[in-house]
Amino acid sequence: TLNSVLNSNAIKNLPPPLGGAAGHPGSAVSAAPGILYPGGNKYQTIDNYQPYPCAEDEECGTDEYCASPTRGGDAGVQICLACRKRRKRCMRHAMCCPGNYCKNGICVSSDQNHFRGEIEETITESFGNDHSTLDGYSRRTTLSSKMYHTKGQEGSVCLRSSDCASGLCCARHFWSKICKPVLKEGQVCTKHRRKGSHGLEIFQRCYCGEGLSCRIQKDHHQASNSSRLHTCQRH
């Protein structure tokens, strides 16, 4: 079960006077009065710590990565898991705790002087080794802040969208990540039908720009589910 792989982290309770309801990611199933959470209380643990469902590492905390909680488990069910400490096994950089990276399947300390060369080697090592992502880069702030001093232009290698200049996002391209343009109105976008499908994209698109959302194109409503075209449309 999921409980066996979760750390026992208690949730902070709300102090008065700001006693709003405890919340959950928006979806169609209500797990607590007034707040939406996909899947209800399926992953409720004894101390009320509910793991966070995710599609990619960037959605998790800084000391977590996104993966299936069971070895060889369903790639469609992914949650944020505690990062791996030094000398623990890994398949990609994001699995290792901040200050470490994945080299030859083991989390090792990142020597900043050598890290840039090492990460280029391990991009190819990481390709295809893990179901939940194809990129060899981590999203760790501790690493990226020292590696990047200026905002990346289109085509620049990046770790996360904040590494890219305005109007660009960090998206997968083969097994690295580069700055690509944020999508404009009318451009084709990717609507992820299931959790974890981000990890299957070798050529990842950016998200739709501000004020736009990825919706099915009006004249494609009659098409079959598999061939439906989504475009960025005004809210």
Epitope: G23, Y52, G61
Partner: nanobody
Framework: EVQLVESGGGSVQAGGSLRLSCTAS????????MAWFRQAPGKEREFVAA????????HYAESVEGRFTISRDNAKNTAFMQMSSLKPEDTAVYYC??????????????????????WGQGTQVTVSS
Amino acid sequence: EVQLVESGGGSVQAGGSLRLSCTASGRPFDNYAMAWFRQAPGKEREFVAAISWSLTRTHYAESVEGRFTISRDNAKNTAFMQMSSLKPEDTAVYYCAAAPRPKRISVRYFSTSSNYDYWGQGTQVTVSS
């Protein structure tokens, strides 16, 4: 000094729309979740909507799901909330807030107000029937 400044509030008829903006200054907020909370007279402050640092996740209170849309522009350090099909019960002071990306995250993180380090002064939204 870090500041969050809300704008876009006002009075509107039921069924109408408003767009709230929250501009952050004093530090980059790309590693923060941005959220909106609201407080109606005589009631506790309640979670409305949040958008993650990754921009890939949005979270809504059940009462606004499908009517409100939260978005953000990291380059401009600004968050937005498009509110449509407004109801009289949406009348409240709306507060913008920013929560840092935590070490560990749970499903409760985004709607737990004590996780938010920075708060705006609020903007009044009044919906009349």
